[in-house]
């Protein structure tokens, strides 16, 4: 039976050109995490495998950094990075748990304006 739950940072926003940490945490289970995938709906960003280590997709190689932990750091953000990101925890013996984070990348001026009000 799958008893675990994924906790995520939920909806987050960041400034264009900046960076953001995508982080998920699996709790309430003793299952062993053997692999974590970071994906968008149409493509894989990165995989952290317990035996193989990190794999970063060539499409993101220049601006994705592994970690901290099983998380992922996105750098040099663009407005096109706005969207949903999925952390997919492969575990034994439970199976697969999925969490989601919605990232909104704001134009610098919009972010600054927002801070003034």
């Amino acid at each position: 039976m799958m008893t675990g739950t994924i906790e995520t940072t939920g909806n987050i926003s960041a400034e264009k050109g900046g960076s953001i940490i995508l982080q998920c945490h699996l709790s309430s289970t003793t299952a062993q995490v053997t692999q974590v995938n970071w994906e968008q709906q149409d493509q894989l960003l990165a995989i952290c495998n317990a035996d193989l280590g990190w794999h970063i997709s060539p499409s993101f190689k220049d601006r994705v950094a592994p970690g901290p932990g099983l998380g992922l750091t996105l750098q040099s953000l663009t407005v096109n990075d706005t969207g949903e990101y999925f952390c997919i925890y492969h575990t034994y013996p439970d199976g697969t748990y999925t969490g989601r984070i919605f990232l909104e990348v704001l134009e610098s001026s919009v972010a600054e304006h927002g801070a003034r009000f």
Epitope: Q35, N37, Q41, D42, Q43, L44, H55, S57, S59, E84
Partner: antibody
Framework: QVQLQESGPGLVKPSQTLSLTCTVT?????????WNWIRQPPGKGLEWMGY???????RYNPSLKSRVTISRDTSKNQFSLKLSSVTAADTAVYYC???????????WGQGTLVTVSS | DIQMTQSPSSLSASVGDRVSITCKAS??????VAWYQQKPGQAPRLLIY???YRYTGVPDRFSGSGSGTDFTLTISSLQPEDFATYYC?????????FGQGTKLEIK
């Protein structure tokens, strides 16, 4: 339990538009996942055609160029495929399927054969 | 697009045999590969995802291995119901592509 069921004409004339619908029961197509069309010509392999995600965004196989459109009717919990300018090469069994996380296909319809012939 | 090349295209074996089917990706897909079984007149059935993870309800005689570009599906002891066609699929990015299939026949 999630179930998918394809429906539509089994015969389409060359140059016309093929239209199929997938009716999903046991799960709302606006709740999660991406909803796909995959086809298989007789005696051949599988070809992913595209999907519409639960949020309504679509992705298509570039090999089909601009001939393919996937849309949805949320009130009926259905999603649809349109393939324009069909030829005999488009004769295939057409499957609808749900994409999981990661992007595997665990739930499929039973498939419907569409023949393109005059 | 990422191409998936399966071998062999057909294979004859007997009940109780151990058989392996291989799949080669045209570029590094890490562990983003799934395997399916298809019987005539039926939709494909998911067996393995992420190269080595058995899907719910799949018998443990089916196992997957590999990473990078080379992947293997192994059936440890063939049962009569295992004679079918098997496909690999990468789930790395769109467009998702499948191997051309391996038809497993009774010897």
């Amino acid at each position: 339990q999630v179930q998918l069921q394809e429906s539509g004409p089994g015969l389409v004339k060359p140059s016309q538009t093929l239209s199929l619908t997938c009716t999903v029961t046991g799960y709302s197509i606006t709740s999660d996942y991406a909803w796909n069309w995959i086809r298989q010509p007789p005696g051949k392999g599988l070809e992913w055609m595209g999907y519409i995600s639960y949020s309504g965004s679509a992705r298509y196989n570039p090999s089909l160029k601009s001939r393919v459109t996937i849309s949805r009717d949320t009130s009926k919990n259905q999603f649809s495929l349109k393939l324009s300018s069909v030829t005999a090469a488009d004769t295939a069994v057409y499957y609808c399927a749900r994409k999981g996380y990661p992007a595997y296909f665990a739930y499929w319809g039973q498939g419907t054969l569409v023949t393109v012939s005059s | 697009d990422i191409q998936m090349t399966q071998s062999p295209s057909s294979l004859s074996a007997s009940v109780g045999d151990r058989v392996s089917i291989t799949c080669k990706a045209s570029q590094d897909v890490s562990t983003a590969v799934a395997w399916y079984q298809q019987k005539p007149g039926q939709a494909p059935r998911l067996l393995i995802y992420s190269a080595s993870y058995r899907y719910t309800g799949v018998p443990d005689r089916f196992s997957g291995s590999g990473s990078g570009t080379d992947f293997t599906l192994t059936i440890s002891s063939l049962q009569p119901e295992d004679f079918a066609t098997y496909y690999c699929q990468h789930h790395y990015s769109t467009p998702y592509t499948f191997g051309q299939g391996t038809k497993l026949e009774i010897k």
